[in-house]
């Protein structure tokens, strides 16, 4: 069953800067992604951005930058101008649509601050990032090597002395990173008994998507929702690569050849999806 994960991050350096990451785990081609806040698409939410795999992105304040991270995940940077930092208690929702198969939506938010006395942004959670861990590890090896060389030199010049132990400084990078449980509401087109899955996703994002894809805002019209079921098993994002097999779109900025005065057809360059025509009236 396809699932959607949502992760909300707060920058440690800029507490007013937030990033929402969303990803789609499952088969099928993504035709549109809608990001909203304050609730799901069509249930009181306010749209922040829409991303289309080929046609581009559209965004609305306070969204700062929406982009594709991979073929199956997106990120949205938000700038919180208000002093009260409303993002800290806001729910962000992502809907992945695959027309006409169905759509799946999940929501997540920053977890509440561990200190009840704190009012606005939650305390950043210390997380040792992989790149810093590598640097620290390398530094440790170098320090140890230098210390050992000094030890050997001293042994040659003087009588053996007790072995020196190099002191290591251990630092951690602060990144406020909340992996929010995301409730995926699957709206399968012909399946009125679709399931809703709750899952957690670790912070793995694959290679960046070429040239930022785009999407559009629309009236929210949903397929029937099904009963909810929850699970606590972590879902890994890496390796769950979903190719966008939509033959009806062209790359942003390119105009495909017209097969008629107003009907535009697109070569099926991304997979078995059949070629589709776009509206031809201008």
């Amino acid at each position: 069953t396809p699932e959607v994960w949502v992760q909300v991050q707060m920058e440690a350096t800029e507490l007013s800067s937030f990033t929402v990451h969303c990803g789609f785990l499952g088969p099928g081609s993504i035709s549109l992604v809608t990001v909203s806040w304050g609730g799901p698409d069509g249930a009181g939410g306010t749209k922040l951005a829409v991303l289309h795999p080929e046609l581009g992105t559209r965004q609305w304040a306070p969204a700062r930058q929406a982009r594709w991270e991979t073929q199956s995940s997106i990120s949205l940077a938000l700038e919180d101008s208000g002093a009260s930092s409303p993002f800290a208690n806001t729910t962000f929702c992502c809907k992945f649509a695959s027309f006409p198969e169905g759509s799946w939506e999940s929501c997540g938010s920053l977890p509440p601050s561990s200190d009840p006395g704190l009012s606005a942004p939650p305390t950043p959670v210390p997380i040792l990032r992989a790149d810093l861990a590598g640097i620290l590890g390398l530094s440790g090896v170098l320090l140890f090597g230098c210390g050992y060389l000094l030890h050997l030199l001293r042994r040659q010049k003087h009588r053996p002395t007790p072995r020196l132990q190099p002191s290591h400084t251990n630092s951690q990078a602060l990144t406020a990173q909340a992996w929010a449980p995301s409730q995926a509401s699957q709206a399968a087109l012909h399946d009125p008994y679709a399931t809703i899955n709750t899952s957690f996703c670790p912070a793995t994002l694959d290679t960046a998507h070429p040239n930022g894809w785009a999407s559009l805002p629309t009236h929210a019209a949903h397929q029937p929702q099904g009963p909810a079921a929850s699970a606590s098993t972590p879902i890994l994002a890496r390796g769950s690569f979903v190719s966008v097999e939509n033959g009806l779109y062209t790359q942003a900025g390119e105009r495909p050849p017209h097969t008629g005065p107003g009907l535009t057809l697109f070569p099926d360059c991304r997979g078995p999806r059949a070629v589709e025509g776009r509206f031809g009236v201008r």
Partner: nanobody, 121 residues
């Protein structure tokens, strides 16, 4: 809960007419466009017609002059009047609500379950 419900499909002879209806409910987002897509048996999806937020209708070439798209804002409904139907119009027709990335295309964000239109003698 957002819902788009199509109706009006059925079997019709070549040259005949049908009127498809789409009742929309539950959405809160502002939208760019509403329209109709279709998928013929064994074929890909095709945008048939859509109406922009400014009320301008747009059609694919193959239906120009035969199909008319219209809206009733009071009823939150969308219609597709199909005249001079041909065998090649046989398809499942989907009502969609979507976003515009360019003037020619209404990218579906939500859609109904579809209604079958069969044109056959």
């Amino acid at each position: 809960e957002v819902q788009l419900v199509e109706s009006g499909g059925g079997l019709v002879q070549p040259g005949g007419s049908l009127r498809l209806s789409c009742a929309a409910s539950g959405y809160t987002f502002s939208t760019d466009c509403m329209g109709w897509f279709r998928q013929a048996p064994g074929k890909g999806l095709e945008g048939v017609a859509h109406i922009d937020s400014d009320g301008i209708p747009r059609y694919v070439d193959s239906v120009k002059g035969r199909f008319t798209i219209s809206q009733d804002h009071a009823k939150n409904s969308l219609y597709l009047q199909m005249n001079s139907l041909r065998a090649e119009d046989t398809a499942v027709y989907y009502c969609v609500v979507g976003f515009k990335f360019d003037e020619d295309y209404c990218a579906p964000n939500d859609w109904g379950q579809g209604t079958m239109v069969t044109v056959s003698s």
